[in-house]
Interface confidence: low
Amino acid sequence: KSSNEATNITPKHNMKAFLDELKAENIKKFLYNFTQIPHLAGTEQNFQLAKQIQSQWKEFGLDSVELAHYDVLLSYPNKTHPNYISIINEDGNEIFNTSLFEPPPPGYENVSDIVPPFSAFSPQGMPEGDLVYVNYARTEDFFKLERDMKINCSGKIVIARYGKVFRGNKVKNAQLAGAKGVILYSDPADYFAPGVKSYPDGWNLPGGGVQRGNILNLNGAGDPLTPGYPANEYAYRRGIAEAVGLPSIPVHPIGYYDAQKLLEKMGGSAPPDSSWRGSLKVPYNVGPGFTGNFSTQKVKMHIHSTNEVTRIYNVIGTLRGAVEPDRYVILGGHRDSWVFGGIDPQSGAAVVHEIVRSFGTLKKEGWRPRRTILFASWDAEEFGLLGSTEWAEENSRLLQERGVAYINADSSIEGNYTLRVDCTPLMYSLVHNLTKELKSPDEGFEGKSLYESWTKKSPSPEFSGMPRISKLGSGNDFEVFFQRLGIASGRARYTKNWETNKFSGYPLYHSVYETYELVEKFYDPMFKYHLTVAQVRGGMVFELANSIVLPFDCRDYAVVLRKYADKIYSISMKHPQEMKTYSVSFDSLFSAVKNFTEIASKFSERLQDFDKSNPIVLRMMNDQLMFLERAFIDPLGLPDRPFYRHVIYAPSSHNKYAGESFPGIYDALFDIESKVDPSKAWGEVKRQIYVAAFTVQAAAETLSEVA
């Protein structure tokens, strides 16, 4: 239950009043408004939307709403020199070309400034050569090709299907394999759910639909030219050769109609197993090159995109706290889209807009939250989380001293089956308690709580009677707050049934067909799932900003630390001889986790008993809770990833979207049997265990009695 600050508010201004003010019809109206034209980062249209949101947030009643601008590196296709891929014959003649744009959806034929499909930040180039099919281009796919099948990608153009991992990891893997170009495509196996029609008659991807997206490997750096510092008016910018995370080979995305034309001619090796076959009527041969009759034909890429320093605009709204104005709870989501942004991001932006409106309504009636709430409409998320990262870099000193929590608000839906939550363990109890108080929108769960439907449909793999809550990875704007600054973070959205729908993301992700109509016709006609997500996100913000004692439970961190220590130990124990030879011990880590568990338990007991009317003691206890997440930050960062500083969680080195626990140890152990110098490699494992054990112990001590 919510425990509200009792001093300056009337009883009606509680969580219920805030939640009751949220309306599905408003979210629908806002979504429509935000999706009628494209809002690509760096364009005039997106600047105008920023100013509109600034104006409306002021009308809603926020204390101040400012634009924060930065000049960052973005990437655009050349309007007069389009990108495409061709098959060329032995004379160099182009006998097949991929399409230059997606066929526009009904009603949008005359919309201008629809950016054609492209891979943002691809270098220019016109490589030609034989094709190699590399499945999803994951680390394990290249291991299979190079180690088992002895297939050499050096000097080849590789074609990879989207899905399973972040596209930037695919490109990095292809580069390391020596490829000279990458073609990304959407296979129906991953982006066409059986029994559903393609858009505009259903929510599946048509053959001409293409997924846009950036292909950077920023590792949390933000603007590639100003890593670590804001891209402001007096910024020193790196040269393009020194820019962080840019790909070195041309990359281009295509749809499955065009992919069919490339894949149907493939020769060489057969696919190693059925997991390499998609749903197209092609053999899925690996190559290299085309089969007999077509063996003299090659693939040629024509990429002419340019990287340009461009101004972007965040909208930052403030609702000042009445009691602790120097404590910030942040709700942020991005505004920029690849095209119309029907789901990504505007289904999230519409929810944020309605949450701001509800808070504003309460404020106009004389209420204020205990702590300050900051609302953010981020720019250039699609180009590498740039808006949020630059703002956090500019305000890092304030945030690390005052940041209580960050709640992310990108796409509200990726399906309509059940809730999906990723968050710090500190927020587990907050999420559980909140969802027990909310009504489920699901059919068959009328009158039941959201917690009940969520637990039934997405049970925890470890704890019966509880729902699954996942680790935070990256690929969204919470990254800088959680992974770099150590601010407790969480995200929530409605998702699909992962058991029955094995496709990656939702089929129309980052395509021109991600429209208002997609949401209104096929995903959420009543906007009841959007409303539920608004209640979860808004409810979390309300509690974090208003509860007298911060709604963080440090005991839940103790539980997961033990689980993660057990997991990494079992990975290491796959090499028992080496562990013995090199005297690798996890005793220090397990000891630190044990100490953390005991200290967290004692802290929780004191938290129940202390005098909450004493503002000094209250502030002291809350600060211990607020700074616990910060205590997991290593100022030196992870090896070769200085902006990923959280010792317990980091984005996987093999998939930016996924979270990895004890990432330093995990990466040191990964593929250790292939390392040049085993003693050096196992020495790094030991060093990482030492770093992890020290960090857990140090974090535990922040929860000890202060004197």
Partner: antibody, heavy 120, light 107 residues
């Protein structure tokens, strides 16, 4: 088919320098650790140096540390060994070698070798 | 550095003989032990890696065993093309080191 072609060997005076090159083809060069191994006339094999696929890690035998530098240009699929302050005992056939994946840091492909003679 | 001692330094054998070469490490190297064959004027060729794993394309008459400090290369039935010098090598820690070699000659 993996091919490793060394070049740059020859006669050099003590204290002189030489740069060996190894052009690699037939495999994904960037993925593999590469090494130099030498063999003095009528003697056994001696490991000299190794470099990881990205070029980020380099390793040297004590006998050449501070005098020899291993490097690679992944864009050219070429391995190098810069040899300075050469001594008579550095006289040997120098082999370029590709390290196999998996345990053992074994060498699964060798070049034909290039002879370096250090003599006044 | 880890010293690798091979024995014998040379041996004479006939076609069809079973031949065993041993290699001892000065400290434990787990199973990070590789065997090579070298013929005069040629580059070495990998036979066995990881103490006992046969490199692809190498005849099955070659086998390897051992772990820790003591290792063995066995040729079950010596063939005319097997007369050569054999080297062991540890890949356990840098610097990698080779044994002194075993020359297998025709009796």
């Amino acid at each position: 088919e993996v091919q490793l072609l060394e070049s740059g060997g020859g006669l050099v005076q003590p204290g002189g320098s030489l740069r060996l090159s190894c052009a690699a083809s037939g495999f994904t060069f960037t993925t593999y650790t590469m090494s130099w191994v030498r063999q003095a006339p009528g003697k056994g094999l001696e490991w000299v140096s190794a470099i990881s696929g990205s070029g980020g890690n380099t390793f040297y035998a004590d006998s050449v540390k501070g005098r020899f530098t291993i490097s690679r240009d992944n864009s050219k699929n070429t391995l190098y060994l810069q040899m300075n302050s050469l001594r008579a005992e550095d006289t040997a056939v120098y082999y370029c070698a590709k390290i196999k994946y998996g345990s053992g840091s074994s060498i699964d492909s060798w070049g034909q070798g290039t002879l370096v003679t250090v003599s006044s | 550095d880890i010293q690798m001692t091979q024995s014998p330094s040379s041996l004479s054998a006939s076609v069809g003989d079973r031949v065993t070469i041993t290699c001892r490490a000065s400290e434990s190297i787990n199973r990070y032990l590789n065997w090579y064959q070298q013929k005069p004027g040629k580059a070495p060729k990998l036979l066995i890696y990881g103490a006992s794993r046969l490199e692809s394309g190498v005849p099955s008459r070659f086998s390897g065993s051992g772990s820790g400090t003591d290792f063995t290369l066995t040729i079950s039935s010596l063939q005319p093309e097997d007369f050569a010098t054999y080297y062991c090598q540890q890949g356990y820690s840098v610097p990698w080191t080779f044994g002194g070699g075993t020359k297998v000659e025709i009796k």
